[in-house]
């Protein structure tokens, strides 16, 4: 059962796995949630009654029964991991801790104007986990305004002490705020020959890469496939680092693959969610339970529902035994990965899906795209919303995209003449406008946030956020789309679609059924040639066929230009403006979302 509240002056007895240091009980809970085995924790706050060496200790605990005896202790704060909860979890921690020195390896020292600048420096440094900044009131003159970047093996401080006039905080890489490049390339027949910080077993290079991405010290990895000649190293995933942050060299080795941590774009890729099944593969580990199950899918469900289960192996039923049910072995290990992987025994293995909630919802796979035709089908574009105005009468005004459970991203020009958010209604999960009746449920708009540099669509900054009055419960027909990663600026999107209920030609009417069109991106240079009278800035992106014929049009404004990359859909553009509709050599112009990621996060993550 999910218990979110913290238990003051309470200590859980026993079950210790490890002790880490965290600046708050809240962050201790996050660390526990992300730890492969932690189900409960006890944090010790600073208190005159406690030994200062025990201040800020966060003891991670496990229990077969999922609970432990409680003992009263002043300054102790205990609680449960969010693993038991169904809500979305994030490792993002923007808090700044005043008068706390978070200890670690100080590998970089420089002058910074503010704690915010220091935090930004940490976020954009590949090694940095957290920082301590000496404010201008710091007693020692030579240390004032010094920004210390720090890292540790675990990503958490090795100790935390009280120190006047300093502030500390964490890297915001997990908040999607890093400008570090995202190197998505996987290198076949390649070994990176740098220091191994850890090694785990993985069924393929993709799982190895995901493990590297959420491991605090891993910057790149090498994976030895099941065909690797040395049997003892098959399926071995080596997690690596180097001083420069990049591999020092590459060595060619057959049946090995190498790649990079995707920590700076982890918000738009699945990192914790290993949803594939591995056939003819057995995962070894500590056995939690053996249950009868009809299929490997059913076995995965059982594992997902058992809070301590990390992975499983399903052995199909022999002929008509046991009512056609096979054996489902629920397993766990100290690090969440199998202790060994065996092939050729007929098992089907996989991982719990419980950790999928630690990934952004936007990375969830959706229905396969319907090829051909222009009309969409239900659930094809679950982030697309129709924004209605009720004044003077109710009508479709613009499109928009769900980017969070309370947030819609759309175009600023949609709100010309809109005096109040009260006249707006957001409908999600809609395919046909005709579905919208008097009693159709909608989301009211609490706030319209228009970019403060917006003047008119053609001059850019055509972007706006709608904060909804209530939260969206994600389903197959309404779920968010990922924002592009700032580290992915070099990605070339080749599978891009524009959707909306807008006109199909210049003089037309709003369409009943959501329309879709696959449209190629056009370089800004090429686009500029087509719009000599306008300035096509890097904050705009263009798409269209040279010969015309397919384009967004009136009524599509604010809707998404959605591009699929590595099996994940990204909101690359917001329909903004163009000359006519689908005209020859007149591409559509869209707001280039990647250039506004900071603005979006600043507005949506504001406390």
């Amino acid at each position: 059962e999910c218990v979110t509240q913290l238990l003051k002056d309470t200590c859980f007895e026993g079950g210790d796995i490890t002790t880490v240091f965290t600046p708050s009980a809240k962050y201790c809970q996050v660390v526990c949630t992300y730890h492969p085995r932690c189900l409960l924790f006890t944090f010790t706050a600073e208190s005159p009654s406690e030994d200062p060496t025990r201040w800020f200790t966060c003891v991670l605990k496990d229990s077969v029964t999922e609970t432990l005896p409680r003992v009263n202790r002043t300054a102790a704060i205990s609680g449960y991991s969010f693993k038991q909860c169904s809500h979305q979890i994030s490792a993002c921690n923007k808090d700044i801790y005043v008068d706390l020195d978070m200890k670690g390896i100080n590998y970089n020292s420089s002058v910074a104007k503010s704690a915010q600048e220091c935090q930004e420096r940490c976020t954009d440094d590949v090694h940095c986990h957290f920082f301590t900044y000496a404010t201008r009131q710091f007693p020692s003159l030579e240390h004032r305004n010094i920004c210390l970047l720090k890292h540790t093996q675990t990503g958490t401080p090795t100790r935390i002490t009280k120190l006047d006039k300093v502030v500390s905080g964490f890297s915001l890489k997990s908040c999607a705020l890093s400008n570090l490049a995202c190197i998505r390339d996987i290198f076949p027949n390649t070994v990176f020959a740098d220091s191994n910080i850890d090694s785990v077993m993985a069924p393929d290079a993709f799982v190895c890469g995901r493990i590297c991405t959420h491991h605090p010290g891993c910057l790149f990895f090498t994976f030895f496939s099941q065909e690797w000649p040395k049997e003892s190293q098959r399926n071995l995933c080596l997690l690596k680092t180097s001083e420069s942050g990049l591999p020092s060299t590459r060595i060619k080795k057959s049946k090995a693959l190498s790649g990079f941590s995707l920590q700076s774009c982890r918000h738009s890729i699945p990192v914790f969610c290993h949803s594939s099944f591995y056939h003819d593969t057995d995962f070894l580990g500590e056995e939690l339970d053996i249950v009868a199950a009809k299929s490997h899918e059913a076995c995965q469900k059982l594992c997902t529902n058992a809070v301590r289960c990390q992975f499983f192996t399903y052995t199909p039923a022999q002929a008509s035994c046991n009512e056609g049910k096979g054996k489902c072995y629920l397993k766990l290990s100290s690090n969440g990965s199998p202790t060994k992987i065996l092939h050729g025994r007929g098992g089907i293995s996989g991982y719990t899906l419980r950790l999928c909630k630690m990934d952004n919802e936007c990375t969830t796979k959706i229905k396969p795209r319907i090829v051909g035709g222009t009309a969409s089908v239900r659930g094809e574009w679950p982030w697309q919303v129709t924004l209605h105005t009720t004044s003077p009468t109710q009508r479709h005004l613009c499109g928009g995209s769900i980017i969070g459970n309370q947030w819609i991203l759309t175009a600023a020009h949609c709100f010309y003449g809109v005096e109040s958010p009260k006249i707006l209604r957001v409908y999600s999960g809609i395919l046909n406008q005709s579905e919208i009746k008097e009693d159709t449920s909608f989301f009211g708009v609490q706030e319209i946030i228009i970019h403060d540099q917006y003047k008119m669509a053609e001059s850019g900054y055509d972007i706006a956020l709608l904060k909804l009055e209530t939260t969206v419960n994600y389903t197959d027909s309404q779920r968010p789309i990922c924002l592009p990663s700032k580290g992915d600026r070099n990605v070339i999107y080749t599978d891009c679609w524009v959707t909306g209920w807008g006109y199909r030609k210049l003089r037309d009417k709003i369409q009943n059924t959501l329309q879709k069109a696959k449209i190629p991106l056009v370089t800004n240079e090429e686009c500029q040639k087509r719009y000599r009278g306008h300035k096509i800035t890097h904050k705009m992106i263009c798409a269209g066929y040279r010969e015309g014929g397919k384009d967004a049009c009136k009524g599509d404004s604010g809707g998404p230009l959605s591009c699929k990359h590595n099996e994940v859909w990204h909101l690359v553009g917001i329909t903004s403006w163009g000359e006519g509709c689908a005209q020859r050599e007149r591409p559509g112009v869209y707001t280039n979302v990647v250039e506004y990621v900071d603005w979006i996060l600043e507005k949506t993550q504001a406390v």
Partner: antibody
């Protein structure tokens, strides 16, 4: 058909700078690792630099490290080599090439001559 | 860095002959070796990779062998267009290094 077309070569004084470009066509440029290889007059081949498809990782020969910068613009299907602090020993024909999974240079451009002389 | 040494530095042969060029690595490189052909005034062309695998479109009269430190390129039944300079390249690790080249001339 794969085509790689280098440009930007010419005569430059020692200590000067030059930027080479390589326009690619006939293949999905953003899927390929790219490299620059040079050949001094009458001499053998020397690998200069490589860049991964995403552009996020670059490698250099010791002889050019800190002076040359390789980059790419996947939207323009173009590879670049920015050469600073040029020396007489940098005089060569500079080839742009694709680097394949075979760990060989699969396709080459026709080359552009860079002459560093006072 | 791995040094590559080719021998001979030049060789004369006639059309129809069989020619062998050798390449030695300063340390073991498994079978990670490539061979290139370069005609005068032209760009190099990949002939063989992984010591013995023919690049597509390359005539079968070219063959490669060897592993570890010693490798050979053999050209059977020389044709006029085969007179060129040949380079070996180690594909074991970065930095990538080439041999100094072997010039194949008409006798």
């Amino acid at each position: 058909e794969v085509q790689l077309l280098e440009s930007g070569g010419g005569l430059v004084q020692p200590g000067g700078s030059l930027r080479l470009s390589c326009a690619a066509s006939g293949f999905t440029f953003s899927d390929y690792e790219m490299a620059w290889v040079r050949q001094a007059p009458g001499k053998g081949l020397e690998w200069v630099s490589s860049i991964v498809p995403s552009g996020g990782w670059t490698l250099y020969a010791d002889s050019v490290k800190g002076r040359f910068t390789i980059s790419r613009d996947n939207s323009k299907n173009t590879l670049y080599l920015q050469m600073n602090s040029l020396r007489a020993e940098d005089t060569a024909v500079y080839y742009c090439a694709t680097w394949g999974d075979s760990w060989g240079f699969d396709f080459w451009g026709q080359g552009t001559l860079v002459t560093v002389s006072s | 860095d791995i040094q590559m040494t080719q021998s001979p530095s030049s060789v004369s042969a006639s059309v129809g002959d069989r020619v062998t060029i050798t390449c030695r690595a300063s340390q073991g490189i498994s079978s990670w070796l490539a061979w290139y052909q370069q005609r005068p005034g032209k760009a190099p062309k990949l002939l063989i990779y992984d010591a013995s695998t023919l690049q597509s479109g390359v005539p079968s009269r070219f063959s490669g062998s060897g592993s570890g430190t010693d490798f050979t390129l053999t050209i059977n039944s020389l044709q006029p267009e085969n007179f060129a300079t040949y380079y070996c390249q180690q594909a074991d690790s970065f930095p990538i290094t080439f041999g100094q080249g072997t010039r194949l001339e008409i006798k």
